[in-house]
Interface confidence: low
């Protein structure tokens, strides 16, 4: 069966939206009105992985682009990147682990934990216009909580 996917946008707990910044980078900033057209639409695919009531493995691709968020080691540090893939082969049910995030729902907020690097989360800075990154702390200054808005396909 084909992998189940939905289209959505994400905003962090400060209501910052995610937009492209260059070809392989996302940043978070406050958008309103017409500017919201700049935000990234994700294709969230439900993939194979450890699943529980509040933890669902997903892959986060960019809608209509052959780019997926992935987690890799750079300079010995878990790092978030946008990675190009062959659109003929993706998305797929059994995604490589670097593409997989555990979508965790807590108090109507979502966290995205790297399956490759447990306890590392998709994060944004408090500051405006800063890159989206993989952070190793929750509940600190950096933001790891998101809300999801469904987008009709």
């Amino acid at each position: 069966a084909p992998v189940r996917s939905l289209h959505c946008t994400l905003r962090d707990a400060q209501l910052k939206s995610l937009v492209m910044s260059g070809p392989y980078e996302l940043k978070a900033l406050h958008l309103q009105g017409q500017d919201l057209e700049q935000q990234v639409v994700f294709s969230m695919s439900f993939v194979q992985g450890e699943e529980s009531n509040d933890k669902i493995p997903v892959a986060l691709g960019l809608k209509a682009k052959n780019l997926y968020l992935s987690c890799v080691l750079k300079d010995d540090k878990p790092t978030l990147q946008l990675e190009s893939v062959d659109p003929k082969n993706y998305p797929k049910k059994k995604m490589e682990k670097r593409f997989v995030f555990n979508k965790i729902e807590i108090n109507n907020k979502l966290e995205f934990e790297s399956a490759q690097f447990p306890n590392w989360y998709i994060s944004t800075s408090q500051a405006e216009n800063m890159p989206v990154f993989l952070g190793g702390t929750r509940g600190g200054q950096d933001i790891t909580d998101f809300t999801m808005q469904f987008v009709s396909s």
Epitope: L31, Q34, D35
Partner: antibody, heavy 121, light 112 residues
Framework: EVQLVESGGGLVQPGGSLRLSCAAS????????MHWVRQAPGKGLEWVAY????????HYADSVKGRFTISRDNAKNSLYLQMNSLRDEDTAVYYC??????????????WGQGTTVTVSS | DIVMTQTPLSLPVTPGEPASISCKSS????????????LAWYLQKPGQSPQLLIY???TRESGVPDRFSGSGSGTDFTLKISRVEAEDVGVYYC????????FGQGTKLEIK
């Protein structure tokens, strides 16, 4: 060809007001953030204000905050700077500048020729 | 505000010779997450508007001759011109884009 043409500069007394305009052509104006940058006579460059594509994110330098208002009309391909409570130190050439959004914020890739504002009694 | 300091302020150069301009920032412009330095260089030729030469400290803007190169990281940056030509005369500005933009005071390059 990208073109940015400023107008509206002139001589004004301290405490007075001016409205600068910038007519943009040669690119899809509504897809780019825009700036005003100024240059006092014989001095260096000073960033003044930034406005995002749909006017919903605006930033100002501390030196003009509360006195200047940046705005845009995408239907008219135009950028504006309303300057109130003008001071002697606002005397400068004011440049309309395009922001290269895809590179990184505040990377200014095209500049107009500038319009001169002189504040003097 | 991040303060940008350029040296020298005046730079007389013989055509064909190299030239180097230094720019120091009051805080690091290196974003450890993107591993990019948010620094740009501009040239303002006499009587003209500024033009973008370099961004991200070392990436040349399209159309900029390859005799221009940018280097450095953190707080110390350099713009080099491998062989100065008469058309390179003008004022060179560094500018940080890590925060709301601030420019250096400018370096005036003139031909000896």
């Amino acid at each position: 060809e990208v073109q940015l043409v400023e107008s509206g500069g002139g001589l004004v007394q301290p405490g007075g007001s001016l409205r600068l305009s910038c007519a943009a052509s040669g690119f899809t104006f509504s897809s780019f953030g825009m700036h005003w940058v100024r240059q006092a006579p014989g001095k260096g460059l000073e960033w003044v204000a930034y406005i995002s594509i749909g006017s919903y994110t605006v930033h100002y330098a501390d030196s003009v905050k509360g006195r200047f208002t940046i705005s845009r009309d995408n239907a008219k391909n135009s950028l504006y700077l309303q300057m109130n409570s003008l001071r002697d130190e606002d005397t400068a050439v004011y440049y309309c500048v395009r922001d290269d959004y895809d590179v990184t914020d505040y990377t200014m890739d095209y500049w107009g020729q500038g319009t001169t504002v002189t504040v003097s009694s | 505000d991040i303060v940008m300091t350029q040296t020298p302020l005046s730079l007389p150069v013989t055509p064909g010779e190299p030239a180097s301009i230094s720019c120091k920032s009051s805080q690091s412009l290196l974003n450890s997450r993107t591993r990019k330095n948010y620094l740009a260089w501009y040239l303002q030729k006499p009587g003209q508007s500024p033009q973008l030469l370099i961004y991200w400290a070392s990436t040349r803007e399209s159309g900029v001759p390859d005799r221009f190169s940018g280097s450095g990281s953190g707080t110390d940056f350099t713009l080099k011109i491998s062989r100065v030509e008469a058309e390179d005369v003008g004022v060179y500005y560094c500018k940080q884009t890590y925060n709301f933009p601030t420019f250096g005071q400018g370096t005036k390059l003139e031909i000896k």
